[in-house]
Interface confidence: low
């Protein structure tokens, strides 16, 4: 029977749906163990420039040998905004200069990369070491490289339509997957159907797709039916801030409770069978259907609630057009230096003109400190004590005032300097989770908890907890307990920073051996990082806490003797 | 052939100041990342401040003892790199290198010998 | 930071004898690299990333190592050998080097 529910595209205020995928137009990954440098080249197509990237690169330690250095060749067809994270990671970068700008500067190795067409790119970067991924992406908003995970059978990489790149590379398309809905005709009531169909990919080994479904309305008011569909090898991993009805292929699993596997049902592979399928569950709307690429995390968002369905005749423009001057892109290239008790502004006139922005001024809070024409660049500098500076204990504040031609209102923005002089960094170890009394004294097999806290606090900066280790002596060796800011192991936990935004963690520690060591180190680098704008201020240092161990205990989980 | 030609040493008093200079040629100096780095019978080699190449922003880079003190610049255009020193101790007494860090340091001038004494 | 100890700190050898100098780090690293000293000059590079041969280097050298043990070794003893070799890391924050170990012959 044939259901009768014409699909249409659905507003974007009505539903969206984002996804990573590890799945690109053309790609290749290959394996290349002994080489000392991994070669990983990106093709990006952006559709108009400028584009914004977010580029993350990780690092996985295999076997001792990470990390190698990464040479990553980026070949792009328009201007890019980067934003680049490779924390730790030898990196060495080819770009061309003119099309790709840092939203901060890399601090990493980088070389010119010549104006070649794409075969002699990868015929260049061959030459450099073997490559061991390489991939075509179209607009991408936001790629994941992970480094070290090569698991392919190839010991050559040569490009290929359509390929699956595993582990080692997923990327989030900028433009939302296509949502439509519609009414299923003579159905009555308000439950409304999210179908998803994840089509098969092009490689056929185990996935877990994690859904996050945001449905904007209080619990009462909904219900719904989740309808999930993918090829035999997927199973799902649900995400969802609402209690409602879930119909999937394959196995699932909720968040909360990962290791619970429910058994799904065999679904139809057709969009009319899947309608069917939400008809059957007495749906009367569907008020999203997507079909997406072999994806590992889809989210969607929609705000329908059983109401009245709307559809939208045609995509709604999401990006400024192209020759209009977007004020928050161009406040967010304003780079903030700190340096010898002067805050510093620069801002590149290059990138300024990629945006189609007219610059009439730029001062700080104070309008008679002006920025200084530089030929290439606008530099804007004052000693701490002058135009206007907020000094606080721990900060220097001051604004940025930039007037533009298109806009009648001059634009703002906060800059900030940290006064490293007056801030201190601490370590807290506590034998509880309430970490209200602490100690200095660790007990195997009892777990610790690890808070860290800079004082006087910082507001407009993060304190992020980029790697602790336990160095336990000869005996010992070093327990890694935090590395790349990600928990170590399972007996590791990363814990909700406390309410005044400090990191915490908590680790339990095992001795296989004796002796067990009396004492220990615990070493952890932390980083200050502004919460908005440029990363050109972010501050790192190394804390330390000299540690006590009682009570042998020899069961267990961490440290080598 | 790579070169790189420090000169500026010399004998201060402690809390004195004195600026070194390093000459390069022989490859783009303007692509290279640049370091000093000291050497004494005490302390042995020591790292002292890196400042990188117009690609990666001329960012600079400081081991902790000289943190403050010393001032790591460059000047492209005339393919040199200098280390301005304040504030100096009878500890940073030693031979300082320039050296270029290409994966490792490929490269190191001859060492121009600096002595803070009273 | 991560402290490079060299071992021994002086090495004697005979011409023709095969030697192994270590480097220890505090905490592991991903590749050591060498260089060589000789009296009155300045640092020369050696091996870098762990292994690899620095240009004019004879092949009688080699570097092995990963973790927190790194060596060099050479296969035969010359008299163009005696110097100090220094190791050097930059895996971590700060940049170190080793204290050193002079290789004198006998």
């Known amino acids: 029977e044939t259901v009768h529910c014409d699909l249409q595209p659905v507003g974007p205020e009505r539903g969206e749906v984002t996804y990573t995928t590890s799945q690109v137009s053309k790609g290749c990954v290959a394996q290349a163990p002994n080489a000392i440098l991994e070669v990983h080249v990106l093709f990006l197509e952006f559709p108009t420039g400028p584009s914004q990237l977010e580029l993350t690169l990780q690092a996985s330690k295999q076997n001792g040998t990470w990390p190698r250095e990464v040479l990553l060749v980026l070949s792009v067809n328009s201007s890019v905004f980067l934003h680049l994270q490779a924390l730790g990671i030898p990196l060495h970068l080819a770009y061309n200069s003119s099309l790709v700008t840092f939203q901060e500067p890399p601090g990493v190795n980088t070389t010119e990369l010549p104006s070649f067409p794409k075969t002699q790119i990868l015929e260049w970067a061959a030459e450099r070491g073997p490559i061991t991924s390489a991939a075509e992406l179209n607009d991408p908003q936001s790629i994941l490289l992970r480094l070290g995970q090569a698991q392919g059978s190839l010991s050559f990489c040569m490009l290929e339509a359509s390929q699956d790149m595993g582990r080692t590379l997923e990327w989030r398309p900028r433009t939302p997957a296509l949502v439509r809905g519609c009414h299923l005709e003579g159905v009555a009531g308000h439950k409304e159907a999210h179908i998803l169909r994840v089509l098969p990919g092009h490689s056929a080994g185990p996935r877990t797709v994690t859904v996050k479904v945001e449905l904007s309305c209080a619990p009462g008011d909904l219900d719904a039916v989740l309808i999930l569909q993918g090829p035999p090898y997927v199973s799902w991993l649900i995400d969802a801030n609402h209690n409602m009805q879930i119909w999937t292929t394959g196995e699932y699993s909720f968040k909360i409770f990962p290791e619970k596997n429910i058994r799904g049902f065999k679904l139809p592979d057709t969009p009319q069978g899947l309608l069917g399928e939400a008809r059957m569950l007495n749906a009367s709307i569907v008020a999203s259907f997507v079909e997406l690429p072999l994806a590992s995390i889809v989210s969607l968002h929609a705000s329908s609630c059983g109401g009245r369905l709307q559809t939208s005749p045609a995509p709604i423009q999401t990006t400024p057009p192209k020759d209009t001057c977007s004020p928050e892109l161009l406040m967010s290239l304003i780079q903030t230096k700190c340096a010898d008790d002067a805050m510093t502004l620069v801002l590149k006139k290059e990138l300024v003109a990629h945006l189609k922005c007219t610059i009439t001024g730029l001062t700080f809070w104070d309008p008679s400190c002006e920025a200084e024409d530089r030929g290439d660049k606008f530099v804007l500098r004052s000693a701490y004590s002058s135009c206007g500076m907020q000094v606080s204990a721990s900060m220097i504040s001051n604004e940025a005032v930039v007037n533009i031609l298109s806009s009648s209102s001059p634009q703002r923005k906060k800059v900030h300097c940290l006064n490293m002089d007056s801030l201190s960094f601490q370590l807290g170890l506590y034998l509880s989770p309430h970490f209200l009394q602490a100690s200095n004294t660790i007990e195997p097999g009892q777990q610790s908890f690890v808070q860290v806290r800079v004082s006087p606090s910082v507001s407009e900066f993060l304190l992020q907890l980029d790697s602790c280790h336990l160095d336990l002596g000869p005996e010992g060796g070093t327990v890694e307990l935090i590395q790349g800011r990600a928990a170590k192991g399972n007996c590791v936990s990363l814990l909700s920073p406390s309410p005044e935004g400090d990191p915490r963690f908590s680790f339990l520690l095992h001795f296989y051996t004796v002796p067990i060591p009396k004492t220990g180190t615990l070493s952890c680098t932390v980083a200050l990082r502004p919460k908005t704008g440029s990363q050109d201020q972010e501050v790192h240092r190394t804390v330390f806490m000299r540690l006590n161990i009682i009570s042998p205990d020899l069961s267990g989980c961490t440290s080598k003797g | 052939e790579v070169k790189l030609e420090e000169s500026g040493g010399g004998l201060v008093q402690p809390g004195g100041s004195m600026k070194l200079s390093c000459a390069a040629s022989g490859f783009t100096f303007s692509d290279a990342w640049m370091d000093w780095v000291r050497q004494s019978p005490e302390k042995g080699l020591e790292w002292v401040a890196e400042?990188?190449?117009?690609?990666?922003?001329?960012?600079?880079y400081y081991a902790e003892s000289v943190k403050g003190r010393f001032t790591i610049s460059r000047d492209d255009s005339k393919s040199s790199v200098y280390l301005q020193m304040n504030s100096l101790r009878a500890e940073d007494t030693g031979i300082y290198y320039c050296t270029r860090w290409r994966r490792f340091f490929d490269s190191w001038g001859q060492g121009t010998t600096l002595t803070v004494s009273s | 930071q991560i402290v490079l100890s060299q071992s021994p700190a002086i090495l004697s050898a005979s011409p023709g004898e095969k030697v192994t100098m270590t480097c220890r780090a505090s905490?592991?690293?991903?590749?050591m690299h060498w260089y060589q000293q000789k009296p009155g000059s300045s640092p020369k590079p050696w091996i870098y990333?762990?292994?690899n041969l620095a240009s004019g280097v004879p092949v009688r050298f080699s570097g092995s190592g990963s973790g927190t043990s790194y060596s060099l070794t050479i296969s035969r003893v010359e008299a163009e050998d005696a110097a100090t070799y220094y190791c050097?890391?930059?895996?971590?924050?700060?940049?170190?080097f080793g204290a050193g170990t002079k290789l004198e012959l006998k």
């Open positions: 905490s592991s690293v991903s590749y």
């Open positions: 990333a762990t292994s």
């Open positions: 050097q890391q930059w895996s971590s924050n700060p940049l170190t």
């Open positions: 400042i990188r190449s117009k690609a990666s922003n001329h960012a600079t």
